[in-house]
């Protein structure tokens, strides 16, 4: 059988390396030798290059190697292969070299941002060696945030003369660590170099950008003092390294300034304590550089009526986020904050919060949120510089079966039946929604009954039991993923009636 | 320039060995395939035997396969060729080519096989 | 194994004359594996046509070939004296490569 017929012939000018082709197919089953010819000099010289030598690399490729590379040029490539029963050629390709030029890779040398020059950032590269002198180049820049994964990109070219290889990238974030990394190639060439080193640049530093701004309003003290938690942040597309040296706060009751009061601080939180009045709240952030735009807020009067407009929300979960979603009755609120922090016990260690524009919904990664913790989620209306009622709901991430089951005890035994009675499973241990309950109790050497109650149930009548019975009992309670029993419980049934008989269990 | 200079011919007696040998310059021999092709006393021409440019490849009609090996030194620029359980039809004039097809032949050498 | 027959094995032609000479082969030769070669008496073959068409180096262009399948023809368009001389045709395509048997031409 003859061979196959070599196809997909792909050839590439290593410039002052090799030129090299490949061609498929890559393995041939029998004894098969490869010979590619080559003519050059624009077809006046001719000579081959054969797969069969000393370093046998692979064996559907072959290289031309100085000094008979001429450039530029315009070559032609046949393949042939022969086993023992003969020969195939392929059909003649046609290369211009400086359509399939593949150079090294350019070396930036320095990435830094010009002095008074704003969000940008001036890459200076050496042209590489191996690279035709007269040529003009084309090159693609890369450049990303440090932190992040996806890269941008923006082409350029370069002519010969253009001695000075350097390009300025413009549009982008004050104070912030780009990663940059080039190539180039020859501009009528299909093959691009590798890419560059990286090299990291910072951009010039500003004045802050602007903050957004919250409070939690607590309830009035004993003297009338109310505490209001302040708490500010970055506003969203803040550059990502701009960097605050301070914050300043200043208040005062409506319609009286000559009352205001300043706070410094250098952290993001800040409790003030205001009277029952409306109070307006100014925040700035402040560097080396200047100040940020004003932050302002306005805290209701004590009394005052706010708006509600929020009449249902769902919370919903995706494969790996979390959609709150509300309807609301005032089409013209299209601001919304949303607040959410871990339904614990105790004080919520954490607390966060964002601000919602002309949408209706919001969405959180499920991966920032613990599993198996349940949360509070609040959304607030904010029309202009007022805040209406909130509308809360409850969310798990992720549910799981509780961590402690029900404990449990047995109440006014009787000679037929028992009421019994369970606590709530504290909130750090419920590892989700509790839909019900069960009660499972068997009769010594007796078969097992059970009954299942709604999750507001926290104590259930047991009847039709057996006088004088040794019973054990226990309570289990269910999520979603599934149920933990309580401790177990052993009690008797009566043989008579006792009105005012006390009964110890065991737990 | 290309040259091919054959040597090696002689009067051998049936069922005899010999080895032909082929000096080549002027071009780089370990880049291409080799060829042995002879001619019969009647001018008629016939391939013999072709090696490739590395040596690892070698290729032979039916009528010598088994009787003849064709090898190559390409740090002496040498072609060879072992024959052995001559018969008198291997009678001819032995020229080696240079190939891609045969484009370059040697003057030849001439090999008798006769009792 | 192709079998090449020449035709016609020996032929004379005078100064000036248009000649052709024939290949037949018994299966079909891709045209890119058909080669013609040019003998004279006391000397060792030379390529004269490569791939049925292309002329090898040196050749005059007075020479030309064409052909495909199992047919194939060289063509001198005017005889010169030094043409004369014994042209063998050869396949490079299925092993065994095979060479025709000739054919002669001399001056008339």
């Known amino acids: 059988v003859l061979p196959a017929k070599p196809e997909n012939i792909s050839c590439i000018f290593y410039y002052e390396e090799n030129f090299t082709c490949t061609w498929s197919p890559e393995k041939e089953a029998s004894y098969t030798w490869y010979k590619v010819k080559r003519t050059y000099s624009y077809g006046y010289k001719s000579d081959i290059c054969s797969t069969d030598n000393s370093t046998r690399g692979n064996h559907a490729s072959c290289s031309f190697l100085p000094p008979t590379i001429t450039n530029p040029d315009n070559y032609t490539i046949q393949v042939e292969a022969q086993n023992a029963d003969g020969i195939m050629k392929s059909d003649i390709t046609y290369w211009n070299l400086d359509a399939i030029m593949k150079i090294e890779p350019p070396e930036i040398f320095s990435v830094k941002s010009v002095l008074g020059i704003k969000r940008m950032l001036q890459i200076k590269w050496i042209r590489p060696v191996l690279a035709p002198h007269s040529s003009t180049l084309k090159y693609t820049l890369r450049f990303r945030t440090i932190n992040s994964a996806y890269w941008m990109e923006v082409n350029f070219t370069k002519e010969d003369i253009d001695r000075d290889e350097t390009y300025n990238l413009t549009e982008l974030q004050a104070f912030t660590e780009y990663v940059m990394t080039l190539r180039c190639a020859p501009a009528e060439s299909m093959f691009w170099s590798g890419w560059s080193q990286e090299k990291v640049g910072t951009t010039e530093e500003e004045a802050p950008y602007g903050l957004d701004l919250w409070r939690v309003l607590k309830p009035a003290m004993v003297d009338g003092r109310r505490p209001v938690q302040l708490m500010w942040k970055k506003a969203t597309g803040a550059p990502v390294l701009e960097k605050a040296l301070g914050y300043n706060i200043w208040y005062f009751p409506e319609n009286n300034t000559n009352l205001t009061e300043t706070v410094n601080t250098t952290n993001q939180t800040h409790e003030l304590y205001l009277g029952g009045k409306t109070y307006w709240v100014y925040v700035v952030s402040y560097n080396s550089l200047g100040e940020s735009p004003v932050a302002t807020l306005r805290i209701p009067a004590l009394n005052e009526k706010t708006f509600q407009c929020i009449e249902a929300m769902q919370a919903c979960l995706t494969q790996d986020q979390l959609v709150v979603e509300w309807q609301s009755s005032a089409p013209e609120v299209d601001t919304w904050m949303v607040e959410w922090f871990p339904d614990v016990d105790s004080e919520p260690s954490s607390f966060s919060w964002e601000s919602v524009s002309q949408a209706r919904n919001w969405t959180i990664q499920k991966d920032e949120l613990k599993p198996l913790w349940c949360y509070n989620i609040s959304v607030y209306p904010v029309l202009r510089d007022r805040v209406g009622q909130p509308y809360s709901t409850q969310a798990y991430v992720q549910e799981g079966i509780p961590s402690a089951g029900p404990v449990t005890q047995a109440d006014s035994i009787g000679v037929k039946t028992v009421t019994i009675t369970w606590k709530e499973i504290p909130k750090s241990k419920r590892n989700g929604f509790i839909k019900n309950y069960t009660i499972f109790y068997q009769a010594e050497d007796g078969k097992e009954f059970s009954k299942t109650v709604n999750s507001n149930i926290l104590q259930y009548r047991l009847e039709s039991l057996t006088r004088r019975t040794s019973y054990s009992l226990q309570v289990m309670a269910s999520t979603n993923a599934g149920g933990t029993n309580g401790t177990k419980i052993n009690f008797k049934t009566l043989s008579i009636s006792h009105h005012h008989h006390h009964h110890h269990h065991h737990h | 320039e290309v040259q091919l200079v054959e040597s090696g011919g002689d009067l051998v007696k049936p069922g005899g060995s010999l080895k032909l040998s082929c000096a080549a310059s002027?071009?780089?021999?370990?880049?291409?395939?080799m060829s042995w092709v002879r001619q019969t006393p009647d001018k008629r021409l016939e391939w013999v035997a072709t090696?490739?440019?590395?040596?690892?490849?070698?290729y032979y009609p039916d009528s010598v396969k088994g009787r003849f090996t064709i090898s190559r030194d390409n740090a002496k620029n040498t072609l060879y060729m072992q024959m052995s359980s001559l018969k008198s039809e291997d009678t001819a004039m032995y020229y080696c080519?240079?190939?891609?097809?045969?484009?370059?032949w040697g003057q030849g050498t001439s090999v008798t096989v006769s009792s | 194994q192709i079998v090449l027959t020449q035709s016609p094995a020996i032929m004379s032609a005078s100064l000036g004359e248009r000649v052709t000479m024939t290949c037949t082969a018994s299966s079909s030769v891709g045209s890119s594996y058909l080669h013609w070669y040019q003998q004279k008496p006391g000397s060792s073959p030379k390529l004269w046509i490569y791939?049925?068409?292309n002329l090898a180096s040196g050749v005059p262009v007075r020479f030309s070939g064409s052909g495909s399948g199992t047919s194939y023809s060289l063509t001198i368009s005017s005889m010169e004296a030094e043409d004369a001389a014994t042209y063998y045709c050869?396949?490079?395509?299925?092993?065994?490569?095979?060479f025709g048997g000739g054919t002669k031409l001399e001056i008339k």
């Open positions: 791939d049925t068409s």
């Open positions: 050869h396949q490079y395509h299925r092993s065994p490569y095979t």
């Open positions: 002027g071009f780089t021999f370990s880049s291409y395939g």
């Open positions: 090696i490739s440019n590395g040596g690892s490849y070698t």
């Open positions: 080519a240079r190939n891609e097809p045969p484009d370059y």
